[in-house]
């Protein structure tokens, strides 16, 4: 999906108002220094592409993030503010959900969510730079 035509301001507002709180809740008990940020993004559409991938594409080490509240909220936000996102992505991520079988490795999921927090912060920063 090409995130170029999204309403970035409204996505930022949703993130700051609600998604960020759920991500932080998920990470509670860990320190910001526990994980190194290895994933980065260069502009707003690129950040959303990376966020989409880390949130919804299951990996062998962490297969269950799509069921989390922050993921459901991310999906709703992208559906609302990225025209055409629903048609191209929702069915695909639902199919992945059904296919998922492997057990969660909690620490690896925490590491992945830590990367997500970094990507969202980068998304906000690139938004501020443009204004």
């Amino acid at each position: 999906y090409d995130f170029t035509n999204c309403d970035f301001q409204k996505i930022e507002a949703d993130y700051l108002r609600t998604i960020s709180k759920d991500l932080i809740t998920y990470m509670s008990g860990t320190k910001s220094t526990d994980f190194n940020n290895t994933v980065s993004c260069s502009n707003r559409p690129h950040c959303l592409t990376e966020i989409q991938s880390l949130t919804f594409n299951p990996t062998p080490r962490c297969a269950s993030l799509a069921k989390e509240m922050f993921a459901r909220k991310t999906k709703a936000t992208l559906a609302l503010w990225c025209p055409g996102y629903s048609e191209t992505q929702i069915n695909a991520t639902q199919a992945m959900k059904k296919a998922r079988k492997s057990k969660v490795t909690t620490n690896k999921c925490l590491e992945q969510v830590s990367q997500l927090l970094g990507l969202w912060r980068r998304f906000i920063r690139t938004l501020l730079k443009k204004q």
Partner: antibody, heavy 120, light 111 residues
């Protein structure tokens, strides 16, 4: 049973406000969009606005901006639509309608409608 | 003033086909594949008949079909039956600010 049940008919004076409720049952209320659509006597459908409780987002039709307020109480699975500064042209049947999950612009389930009459 | 334009009436005999048009702009129908159609019988709430231009919800007969060309969407009812007599409304997504527009409605009469 999957349904939307709306509050009863209202008669209001011009200049006053009306608040209509819409109670959902049989589905996960927060994940869907709840839109409000009205229909004046003998007229077509007119969209007022939508709320997506999951992300606490509301979008209003430009025509009703500042006059309509849509809220939701997830604890009771109830959506509300308040319309202020009522005039006779607001006399209509007001429907709540469920927007499909992540496809909030298709209304696959409707309430029975609430007749709001504005008359002095 | 409706954002989407529909003919006020359409008619056909039982067994025939009838097509109802819905004309918008590049900002709504032409810009997105997010057209839906609703059937409304007198005194009843509307019912979703078509979504995403041409998809049918479960329970809707395959006599109902939808299509789109440019800025115009169409609903075709084939093999008309008496119970198809109703008002039909098109609707289109119209962007993140405007969200949804309805057409003015078409009264379908089965002769």
């Amino acid at each position: 049973q999957v349904q939307l049940v709306q509050s009863g008919a209202e008669v209001k004076k011009p200049g006053s406000s009306v608040k209509v409720s819409c109670k959902a049952s049989g589905f996960t209320f927060g994940s869907y969009g709840i839109s409000w659509v009205r229909q004046a006597p003998g007229q077509g459908l007119e969209w007022l606005g939508v709320i997506v409780p999951l992300v606490d987002v509301t979008i209003y039709a430009e025509k009703f901006q500042g006059r309509v307020t849509i809220t939701a109480d997830t604890s009771t699975s109830t959506a509300y639509m308040e319309l202020s500064s009522l005039r006779s042209e607001d006399t209509a049947v007001y429907y709540c309608a469920r927007g499909q999950e992540y496809f909030y612009w298709y209304f696959d389930l409707w309430g029975q409608g609430t007749l709001v009459t504005v008359s002095s | 003033q409706s954002a989407l334009t529909q003919p006020p009436s359409a008619s056909g005999s039982p067994g025939q086909s009838v097509t109802i048009s819905c004309t918008g702009t590049i900002s709504d129908i032409g810009g997105y594949n997010r057209v839906s159609w609703y059937q409304q019988h007198p005194g009843k709430a509307p019912k979703l008949m078509i979504y995403e231009v041409s998809k049918r919800p479960s329970g809707v007969p395959d006599r109902f079909s939808g299509s789109k060309s440019g800025n115009t969407a169409s609903l075709t009812v084939s093999g008309l039956q008496a119970e198809d007599e109703a008002d039909y409304y098109c609707s289109s997504y119209a962007g993140t600010d405007t969200f949804v527009f309805f057409g003015g409605g078409t009264k379908l009469t089965v002769l």
